[in-house]
């Protein structure tokens, strides 16, 4: 759910930490009407997830993490 | 030690609705996701959806949107299911599962399920 | 939705044997695959998560492997008690889908 670079929507599926190699914040107050989590996957797709809901912290959490490391 | 216990056999007619509970022990209720699986009669396992009791959030599988609903009560640490518009497709053993990511998103604790006959 | 299919659907053995049950997704889910065991009138019990870790207190005899699309889920030495349904889970993505289960059954 996105247009011009902007997630308009969340999904309301549940993503795998396998299945996203990164991810982009979106911030409202930067050009863009919500907050969002914008997960890249495997399959090259974006997808828009609410930065509120508890999986998708626990991915942020874990993606950060793993950049720390390196 | 985790346990879910969840409420006993039900027999519905065709078109009522049943609530079914699953109440957790043994654990931070908040810290896991519980879903909903259902078996039918000699069929597999089908995946009904999920709820997060920190927040409430649900997301659900297609077939089952706007037959199952899924709520929580963390006073008592208890999900509950509600199925509506019952019909005879509808007669299973329904679990309730916790679901965590820390085993790779696993259905790591089972309830001992709760039978369900839809019958006229 | 990810399709899962499990092969074979049933299948006789013996005790001691050495059992080999498969399940391939419809795409890749990048080993976000889960094993369950279910024995009649029980709840379902977590076997492998990760496609190869062995679920706390599950005996060493059970194994997973596999990745991709194809996975495998081995019994080194059957035991009377592995007498059961197997099933596969892909958890890469919701909806969460089941393969529709191997019965094992004593030859």
């Known amino acids: 759910a996105s247009n011009f670079d902007c997630c308009l929507g969340y999904t309301d599926r549940i993503l795998h930490p396998k299945f996203i190699v990164g991810f982009t914040r979106q911030l409202a107050n930067e050009g863009c009407d919500i907050n969002a989590i914008i997960f890249h996957t495997k399959k090259k797709l974006s997808v828009c997830a609410n930065p509120k809901q508890t999986w998708v912290k626990y991915i942020v959490r874990l993606l950060s993490k793993k950049v720390k490391n390196m | 030690q985790v346990q879910l216990v969840q409420s006993g056999a039900e027999v519905k007619k065709p078109g009522a609705s049943v609530k079914v509970s699953c109440k957790a022990s043994g654990y931070t209720f908040t810290n896991y996701w519980m879903h909903w699986v259902k078996q039918a009669p000699g069929q597999g396992l089908e995946w009904i959806g999920v709820?997060?009791?920190?927040?409430?959030?649900?997301t659900y599988n297609q077939k089952f949107k706007g037959k199952a609903t899924m709520t929580r009560d963390t006073s008592t640490s208890t999900v509950y299911m509600e199925l509506s518009s019952l019909r005879s497709e509808d007669t299973a053993v329904y679990y309730c599962?916790?679901?965590?990511?820390?085993?790779?998103?696993?259905?790591?604790?089972w309830g001992q399920g709760t039978s369900v006959t839809v019958s006229s | 939705d990810i399709q899962m299919t499990q092969s074979p659907s049933s299948l006789s053995a013996s005790v001691g044997d050495r059992v080999t049950i498969t399940c391939g997704a419809s795409?890749?889910?990048?080993?976000?695959l889960n094993w369950y065991q279910r024995k009649p009138g029980k709840a379902p019990k977590l076997l492998i998560y990760?496609?190869?870790n062995l679920a706390d207190g599950v005996p060493s005899r059970f194994s997973g492997s596999g990745s991709g699309r194809d996975y495998t889920l081995t019994i080194s030495s059957l035991q009377p008690e592995d007498f059961a349904t197997y099933y596969c889970?892909?958890?890469?993505?919701?909806?969460?889908?089941f393969g529709q289960g191997t019965k094992l059954e004593i030859k």
């Open positions: 599962t916790r679901g965590n990511y820390g085993v790779d998103y696993a259905m790591d604790y």
């Open positions: 709820i997060d009791p920190s927040d409430s959030y649900t």
């Open positions: 889970q892909n958890v890469l993505i919701t909806p969460y889908t």
């Open positions: 990760g496609a190869t």
């Open positions: 795409e890749n889910i990048y080993g976000a």
